[in-house]
């Protein structure tokens, strides 16, 4: 049975030009976290193993950095950043959690966090 | 291009080691990881491991875990899987293949030729 | 683990007709929350390493033919070759790419009736 919930930084803002982390937090179970992925609806981004440690997308190498903790960072963010992102938490026993963000990349120099959210 | 070349075929006898080796061409070698599937004769594909050539961290199936070891070594661009304990189960064609991300997804997207090992007394 | 199942094991066509195959998986290689199934296909010929045909399920890789397609979700996937021709007499493996350790079914070997 899945217990466990993903909190998440919900909908948040950052400048072009910019960086901004992606964190999400696993609670509620006592499952073994395998492996973090972290995707866009369509674009892996980046992998966290436990044994493997992590795999940045070749793609995305330039732009994104590992961490911290589980999280991912992107650097040098455009427009085209805007979007969901998605933390996909592999675990054992439990199976797959999936946790929302989504980022609004601003052309202005004002970007505020939203409000943290849970997902079940 | 990119190409995996592997080590020529091997005979050994029971009880030795092997190790096989996958030199990687034409892409950044420490930006993909590669991935090791054993093909006994007659029969389908099982896969043995894989490493991350950026971290040096590896993964293995249960199965092989305690005698299969896979190395990177970046300086030569070339992967490496050495088998312990062999026996004659062990005698498969093993491949290397590098993991590319197509989409949201980790594909094997380049193999190389494949290495016959054969276990022998 | 997740185990992958095939069938058939093999399977004989006549040229230009239509040839199945299934693969079920033990767990679902569905994640609803992205709607992405992780699920690939290769072709292996005689002699030669595998090779990519399919993935996410239902995309082809570049420059495969469109006589092949995938299909199916969670659990239960096709792959379709909608006219068989000569030279796709081959073993055909689905494999799941949600999880490590990255399984394979047990293969499907397609032959000519």
């Known amino acids: 049975m899945m217990t466990g919930t993903i909190e998440t930084t919900g909908n948040i803002s950052a400048e072009k030009g910019g960086s901004i982390i992606l964190q999400c937090h696993l609670s509620s179970t006592t499952a073994q976290v395998t492996q973090v992925n972290w995707e866009q609806q369509d674009q892996l981004l980046a992998i966290c193993n436990a044994d493997l440690g992590w795999h940045i997308s070749p793609s995305f190498k330039d732009r994104v950095a590992p961490g911290p903790g589980l999280g991912l960072t992107l650097q040098s963010l455009t427009v085209n950043d805007t979007g969901e992102y998605f933390c996909i938490y592999h675990t054992y026993p439990d199976g797959t959690y999936t946790g929302r963000i989504f980022l609004e990349v601003l052309e202005s120099s004002v970007a505020e966090h939203g409000a943290r959210f849970q997902i079940p | 291009q990119v190409q995996l070349v592997q080590s020529g075929a091997e005979v050994k006898k029971p009880g030795a080691s092997v190790k096989v080796s996958c030199k990687a061409s034409?892409?950044?070698?420490?930006?993909?990881?590669i991935e090791w599937v054993k093909q006994a004769p007659g029969q389908g594909l099982e896969w043995i491991g894989v490493i991350n050539p950026g971290s040096g961290g590896s993964k293995y199936n249960e199965k092989f875990k305690g005698r299969a070891t896979i190395t990177a070594d970046k300086s030569t661009s070339t992967a490496y899987m050495e088998l312990s304990s062999l026996r004659s189960e062990d005698t498969a064609v093993y491949f290397c293949?590098?993991?590319?991300?197509?989409?949201?997804?980790?594909?094997?997207?380049?193999w190389g030729q494949g290495t016959t090992v054969t276990v022998s007394s | 683990d997740i185990v992958m199942t095939q069938s058939p094991d093999s399977l004989a066509v006549s040229l230009g007709e239509r040839a199945t195959i299934n693969c079920k998986s033990s767990?679902?290689?569905?994640?609803?929350?992205?709607?992405?199934?992780?699920l690939a296909w290769y072709q292996q010929k005689p002699g030669q390493p595998p090779k990519l045909l399919i993935y996410?399920?239902?995309t082809r890789e570049s420059g495969v033919p469109d006589r092949f397609s995938g299909s199916g979700s969670g659990t239960d996937f096709t792959l379709t070759i909608s006219s068989l021709q000569a030279e796709d007499v081959a073993v055909y493996y689905c494999?799941?790419?949600?999880?490590?350790?990255?399984?394979f079914g047990g293969g499907t070997k397609l032959e000519i009736k």
């Open positions: 767990q679902s290689l569905l994640n609803s929350g992205i709607q992405k199934n992780y």
């Open positions: 996410g399920a239902s």
């Open positions: 293949a590098r993991t590319g991300v197509y989409g949201n997804f980790l594909i094997f997207d380049y």
């Open positions: 494999q799941n790419d949600h999880r490590y350790p990255f399984t």
């Open positions: 034409g892409y950044a070698f420490t930006n993909y990881l």
